[in-house]
Interface confidence: low
């Protein structure tokens, strides 16, 4: 649709509350270092301007694009050059180059202090004193730390955040009510951010064909009763929504997402029997519910795929007529029959099928050539099946913390050039796959595990792209989206790596260790473990286990001592010397 005033159109469609929230998120994701008050001021100015355009769409500047309006507003920030350096040069560009420039300067790892949670009473007072500001601050703090967070979903998180405070600040035991809810929102929020980051990376690095393929596979698993045409329509619409959000077009994205939810709820009969309970909910909750909806039951009478995709004499004719659509239909048919496969595996199978057709349709006897194509799938299917089986066995044997440590060692040996904080963060998250997926029934393990690993490895790729240090990581991250996980799995010990010189300072600990939370203690120990492996990449599991056991004993001993700092000062050098000897 063309509108005289895009800003008026979106304001009317979204309503003032969502409009203001989305503009705040957009600005916070672009200018991640700006103080809260500065963003609130900019948002209020944009909102007032939008209201003048609603009153008169012909008013001055109301016909400008949203990128022009928002970019002009961001470029008025007084401290742009000193705060953001070369990002200020974006303001010298014209649209659309200016917006592209802002997007390129989004920082996935901004230098911002970790969010500290105040006392419950302090938070409840702030909530009651000024609820609107309290919620805006939440949007701002999350958005600036997660510059690709799915904006309409962040509004849903903010609504849940508000509901938690509204309920718990009146409870007898405020903390018991509130803290578990905040923990849940934090964990879900981090997961949501990481999943969206993969969608944006898929679109930005591999193009919308890659994203559409992912969406065809995933939606076909979710909606196996839907016709291919219906799935195709949903894929096209979903691609538009995510392209907009990943491109910073948050108002259009939220508007189109609402339209998609409306369409799905109006067409439930031709999509899925599972949508009903989602469709009774209010907008934000409805969209979230639809995105997370469980897979519908598979139709009982699905015929074998071989007839249309192997045995038919028209395979090459159909493929040649419309390659992407034919492959799309193959992917749809395969995915709807295999909710037990990961999306990434399904995409690998479609790629293998495509490669076979490319080769065979040029052969003297195409049918003879591609007759055994399904046999070629077997090793592709078995590889993730075996990987999940082995890692779940290891997880069950070790427990989460030690499983994380095994992965830390494994990944540090593969890519020792990667920074220690990144290796710790990524390996800890890889290790969470155990608790998340290994308890599930067999049929759900692979889709859970491999698709989760894809999200975590994307985080490694995104961080590595900012500061590239390893050709192996670059290769695995850029060559093929669907083969990223197998590429990392296949990496061996990096023989070319020159071990890091021993630095006693890295292994010097103080009494503050004793006051850390269990999670923070684990991170300290895991940081030391990575540094050990970087120093001695060929150390055996037994050697590393011995050193880590000694470390745990040393910390426990000193944390029980009367003079903790003196104990660390005395026992620390002994621990270091013993560790060096053990690894010699």
């Amino acid at each position: 649709d063309t509108h005289k005033s895009e800003v008026a159109h979106r304001f009317k469609d979204l309503g003032e509350e969502h409009f203001k929230g989305l503009v705040l998120v957009a600005f916070s994701q672009y200018l991640q270092q700006c103080p809260f008050e500065e963003h609130v001021k900019l948002v209020n100015e944009v909102t007032e301007f939008a209201k003048t355009c609603v009153a008169d769409e012909s008013a001055e500047n109301c016909d400008k694009s949203l990128h022009t309006l928002f970019g002009d507003k961001l470029c008025t920030v007084a401290t742009l050059r000193e705060t953001y350096g070369e990002m200020a040069d974006c303001c010298a560009k014209q649209e659309p180059e200016r917006n592209e420039c802002f997007l390129q300067h989004k920082d996935d790892n901004p230098n911002l202090p970790p969010l500290v949670r105040p006392e419950v009473d302090v938070m409840c007072t702030a909530f009651h004193d000024n609820e609107a500001t309290f919620l805006k601050k939440y949007l701002y703090e999350v958005a600036r730390r997660h510059p690709y967070f799915y904006a309409p979903e962040l509004l849903f998180f903010a609504a849940r955040y508000k509901a938690a405070f509204a309920e718990c600040c009146q409870a007898a035991d405020k903390a018991a009510c509130l803290l578990p809810k905040l923990d849940e929102l934090r964990d879900e929020g981090k997961a949501s951010s990481a999943k969206q980051r993969l969608k944006c990376a898929s679109l930005q690095k591999f193009g919308d064909r890659a994203f559409k393929a992912w969406a065809v596979a995933r939606l076909s698993q979710k909606f196996p009763k839907a016709e291919f045409a219906e799935v195709s329509k949903l894929v096209t619409d979903l691609t538009k929504v995510h392209t907009e959000c990943c491109h910073g077009d948050l108002l259009e994205c939220a508007d189109d997402r609402a339209d998609l939810a409306k369409y799905m709820c109006e067409n439930q009969d031709s999509i899925s029997s599972k949508l009903k309970e989602c469709c009774d909910k209010p907008l934000l909750e409805k969209s979230h519910c639809l995105a997370e909806v469980e897979n519908d039951e598979m139709p009982a009478d699905l015929p074998s795929l071989a007839a249309d995709y192997v045995e038919s004499k028209d395979v090459c004719k159909n493929y040649a007529e419309a390659k992407d659509v034919f492959l799309g239909m193959f992917l749809y048919e395969y995915a709807r029959r295999h909710p037990d496969y990961s999306v990434m595996l399904l995409l690998r199978l479609a790629k293998a099928y495509e490669a076979t057709l490319e080769k065979c349709c040029a052969a003297a006897d195409p049918h003879e050539c591609y007759a055994k194509v399904f046999d070629e799938f077997q090793p592709l299917v078995e590889e993730p099946q075996n990987l999940v089986k082995q890692n779940c066995e290891l997880f069950e044997q070790l427990g989460e913390y030690k499983f994380q440590n095994a992965l830390l060692v494994r990944y540090t040996k593969k890519v020792p050039q990667v920074s220690t904080p990144t290796l710790v963060e990524v390996s800890r998250n890889l290790g969470k796959v155990g608790a998340k997926c290994c308890k599930l029934p067999e049929a759900k393990r692979m889709p859970c595990a491999e698709d989760y690993l894809s999200v975590v490895l994307n985080r490694l790729c995104v961080l590595h792209e900012k500061t590239p240090v390893s050709e192996k990581v670059t290769k695995c991250c850029t060559e093929s989206l669907v083969n990223r996980r197998p590429c990392f799995s296949a990496l061996e010990l990096d023989e070319a790596y020159v071990p890091k010189a021993f630095n006693a300072e890295t292994f010097t600990f103080h009494a503050d260790m004793c006051t850390l939370s269990e999670k923070e203690k684990q991170v300290k120990k895991q940081t030391a473990l990575v540094e050990l492996v970087k120093h001695k990449p060929k150390a055996t599991k037994e050697q590393l286990k011995g050193v880590m056991d000694n470390f745990a004993a040393f910390v426990e001993k000193c944390c029980k001592a009367d003079d903790k700092e003196a104990c660390f000062a005395e026992e620390g050098p002994k621990f270091v010397a013993a560790s060096q000897a053990a690894l010699a």
Partner: nanobody
Amino acid sequence: QVQLVESGGGLVQPGGSLRLSCSASGSIWGIYHMGWYRQAPGKGLELVASITVDGSTHYADTVKGRFTISRDNSKNMVYLQMNSLEPEDTAVYYCDIRNVGGDYWGQGTQVTVSS
């Protein structure tokens, strides 16, 4: 690459009829939506009529009972039969076809209803 070409537009008197045609060339397989949109001078783009993969149709309130959309699957053609034309129907008419590959638009054909 898919190309859409509209034809059949022109000048017609109020109460008259026109039949618009839209043909698609290139790889356009697995179509799920075909539609006609129009844009009058100084106005936004509006949906006139659409037809889905299963043949179900949708019409704007302003054209119901006067316009009929149809398609020929074998030829990748979509038609718009316009009867009882009114001056308010004056606009550029665009054809839109959607498949898994994307959303494809024609260049438009001018329809002018005037005495």
